[in-house]
């Protein structure tokens, strides 16, 4: 921490300039004033302060604002951005989506996303909704931090919004989110026809049911292996072979490659070998011929 | 990420003179704001001791105004730091920076000794 001094008369700060860069940390501690530097926070971003003072600099502010700075500060935090930590941004109320791509364009390639997903997380927040202008900025400035959204963030998407997320922006979502999302993007491209429907709708099918992946297998999409290897396991598990082969098409080779992975392998092990061995691809792990498969856990359900 | 190297420090008795250079790896170098700051010991704060503008425009910190002069020569992609009338409180290691907001990256830094 920085010690507390008195000002020497001669370092007297009354304007936030450049000749600050002269001042050692106890000497920007005693002189400038706290409500001086966030009246004249624009003017921070264009001096060429060290790490170490710009911490003196957020030192002064937090004295200042110890509930959350305002926006008119937040929007001028330039580099003094990467000084704050998820807890600093949590306390901010930030409306203004130009002060969110702001703060994108600076904290581009530095290990700040931790501080990125709260700062979303506080706009979605603030604007009361995940609205069309929000998912704009997000997919123009920081694609895949849609993905750092929690699902009750997620929640608040319009399905009339969803058209404006591109496949790459899901790239880093979870299951959770998917599921969020999944029924919204089925709401939103549901007048569209067979091929363009499952263009749209294949980036968010992570969070689809298996009805749904069944649906698709009458289709004749032709699934590419990593769209169904992003599949929910559970909406995988109870299609048939023939559901399975009619939904990937041509790409139903693309199983042998991934015989040990999940969900592949996981499907594998609930078919009957003789039902594998129709796809002639050389599938092992089913189960074998003449043995008898008891559900048990619809048994517990009836008990 | 620009690399600079800092060179030309060493033992120097009190009210001699020694001559610092940093060159940059940058070829966009003569637009480059340029600093030298000094580290009296491991741990403590670099403070600036000057700083030259692209237009060759010079400030410095009271304690070496008049003994220190920063220069530059843009063919060379190199800033100089020429210091006489050393004191033994001039003593640490010397580092340059390109002045730009954001930019905190440092040389190795070159170690200057003035024994009284």
């Known amino acids: 921490d920085v010690e507390r001094t008195t000002c020497p008369p001669e370092k007297e700060v009354h304007e936030i300039d450049e000749s600050l860069i002269f001042y050692k940390k106890r000497e920007l501690e005693a002189c400038v004033d706290a409500a001086l530097l966030a009246a004249q926070m624009d003017r921070v971003d264009a001096i060429p302060f060290t790490y170490e003072q710009l911490d003196v600099l957020k030192h002064k502010l937090d004295e200042l604002y110890p509930q959350g700075y305002p926006e008119s500060v937040i929007r001028h935090l330039g580099h003094l951005f990467l000084k704050m930590s998820p807890e600093d941004i949590r306390k901010w109320n930030v409306t203004s989506l130009e002060t969110l791509k702001a703060l994108l364009k600076v904290s581009k390639g530095h290990e700040m996303s931790a501080q990125v997903a709260t700062l979303i997380d506080r706009v979605v927040v603030g604007r009361g909704q995940l609205d069309k202008d929000t998912v704009d900025t997000l997919t123009a400035f920081c694609p895949g931090c849609l993905c750092s959204l929690s699902p009750e963030r997620l929640s608040s998407v319009p399905p009339s919004v969803i058209g404006a997320v591109r496949p790459q922006d899901l790239d880093t979502c979870g299951p959770r989110q998917l599921d969020v999302l999944y029924p919204k993007a089925r709401l939103a491209f549901q007048n569209m026809s067979g091929s363009e429907y499952f263009v749209k709708i294949r980036p968010f099918l992570g969070g689809a049911p298996t009805e749904d992946v069944k649906a698709l297998s009458q289709q004749n999409v032709s699934m590419d292996l990593a769209t169904f290897m992003k599949l929910r396991r559970e909406a995988v598990l109870p299609l048939t072979v023939a559901e399975v082969q009619k939904l990937l098409g041509p790409h139903v080779e693309g199983l042998k490659v991934e015989e040990q992975h999940s969900p592949v392998r996981d499907w594998i092990l609930k078919q009957r070998q003789d039902d594998l061995d129709t796809l002639g691809l050389g599938l092992q792990g089913g189960i074998p011929n003449g043995y008898l498969i008891l559900d048990l856990s619809v048994r517990e359900a009836l008990s | 990420q620009v690399q600079l190297v800092e060179s030309g420090g060493g033992l120097v008795q009190a009210g001699g003179s020694l001559r610092l250079s940093c060159t940059a790896s940058?070829?966009?170098?003569?637009?480059?704001?340029m600093g030298w700051y000094r580290q009296e010991a491991p741990g403590k704060e670099r403070e600036l001791v000057a700083?030259?503008?692209?237009?060759?425009?010079?400030n410095y910190a009271d304690s070496v105004k008049g003994r220190f002069t920063i220069s530059r020569d843009n063919a060379k992609n190199t800033v100089y730091l020429q210091m006489n009338s050393l004191k033994s409180e001039d003593t640490g290691v010397y580092y340059c920076?390109?002045?730009?907001?954001?930019?905190?990256?440092w040389g190795q830094g070159t170690q200057v000794t003035v024994s009284s």
């Open positions: 940058e070829s966009g170098f003569s637009a480059n704001y």
């Open positions: 700083t030259i503008n692209r237009f060759g425009s010079t």
């Open positions: 920076r390109i002045m730009r907001p954001g930019n905190w990256y």
